[in-house]
């Protein structure tokens, strides 16, 4: 499995962000596919569970991401993206996307460095 992410993402406090993660695999996508999203905070604290997908999407039942994350992927299109709502400044950090698609071997975990800012920089307005 090979994973592709946007690497760096800047988003405005209070808005929603799509954390894009796509993948390729020599094995067909089926019921064995799993996607795990985790979060490493900037302060170096323990990694946190964000989201899990296996046949169905599953939000965390506890913690900072409870009721703030949803599935925005499409496995048939090799898309494992999620939506993170109501961004806060302490959402700053690294989000990891891990895709397993047996019998394909696990690949390198994808990473997105999210920066939550007060206002978007002018140079990035055309991306919105």
């Amino acid at each position: 499995v090979e994973i592709y992410t946007s690497r760096v993402l800047e988003a405005v406090n209070g808005t929603d962000a799509r954390l894009k993660c796509t993948f390729s695999s020599f094995a067909p996508v089926g019921d064995a596919l799993t996607v795990t999203w985790n979060f490493r905070p900037l302060d170096g604290g323990p990694e946190q569970f964000v989201f899990y997908y296996h046949i169905d999407p599953f939000q965390p039942m506890s913690g900072r991401f409870k009721d703030r994350v949803s599935w925005d992927g499409n496995p048939e299109r090799y898309d494992a993206s999620i939506l993170l709502w109501k961004l806060q400044f302490d959402d700053n950090g690294t989000y990891t996307c891990q895709v397993k698609n047996p019998p394909d071997v696990d690949g390198v975990i994808g990473e997105i460095r999210l920066s939550v800012v007060h206002t978007v920089r002018f140079s990035e307005i055309h991306f919105l």
Partner: antibody, heavy 116, light 106 residues
Amino acid sequence: QVQLVQSGSELKKPGASVKVSCKASGYTFTNYWMHWVRQAPGQGLEWMGEINPTNGGTDYNEGFTGRFVFSVDKSVSTAYLQISSLKAEDTAVYYCTIYTTALDYWGQGTLVTVSS
Amino acid sequence: DIQLTQSPSFLSASVGDRVTITCRASSSVGYMYWYQQKPGKAPKPLIYVTSNLASGVPSRFSGSGSGTEYTLTISSLQPEDFATYYCQQWSSNPPTFGQGTKLEIK
């Protein structure tokens, strides 16, 4: 490194109250919800509930409402479990634990013994 | 509440053995956690969300499953693996634990 240090063992009489503390260090206290788990002697694990240290919001498991109260003091990065009107069946080890990718970090446990 | 039933409840095995513990849920759950507990100690996480190894856990431990049936496998038992193992679901509130599987030296 992350540490959760709980207060020492308690021996209480039925009807009394007890307050167990859990002092957190090595991480940002408000970033992780604190959970409480009970283990009666020789028995399995039972999730009691959780508290959000940021705003004090709580979620209690059925069976742990009324006599059980979770609280936090952010200024000293400490969570508390208070049990009132103690009964013999409250005799157990009480653990605090934080949810990260799982219940990854645990206190050493506090044995509360209720006996007349 | 979702009930988790582990089998077996007790298991005798020898160093080097391959061991599998099963956890069955009363209704479908999305993922499973596994913990190891030694006498007088707090539980230690082994597996999170079904198949991911917790930090510092040796690769001889693995998890799998879906729906109502999940398994924890230890590929080659080591002396330090003799303990009690618990499964836990948290894809539905409240989180619940299995009754435990005590793994003893044969």
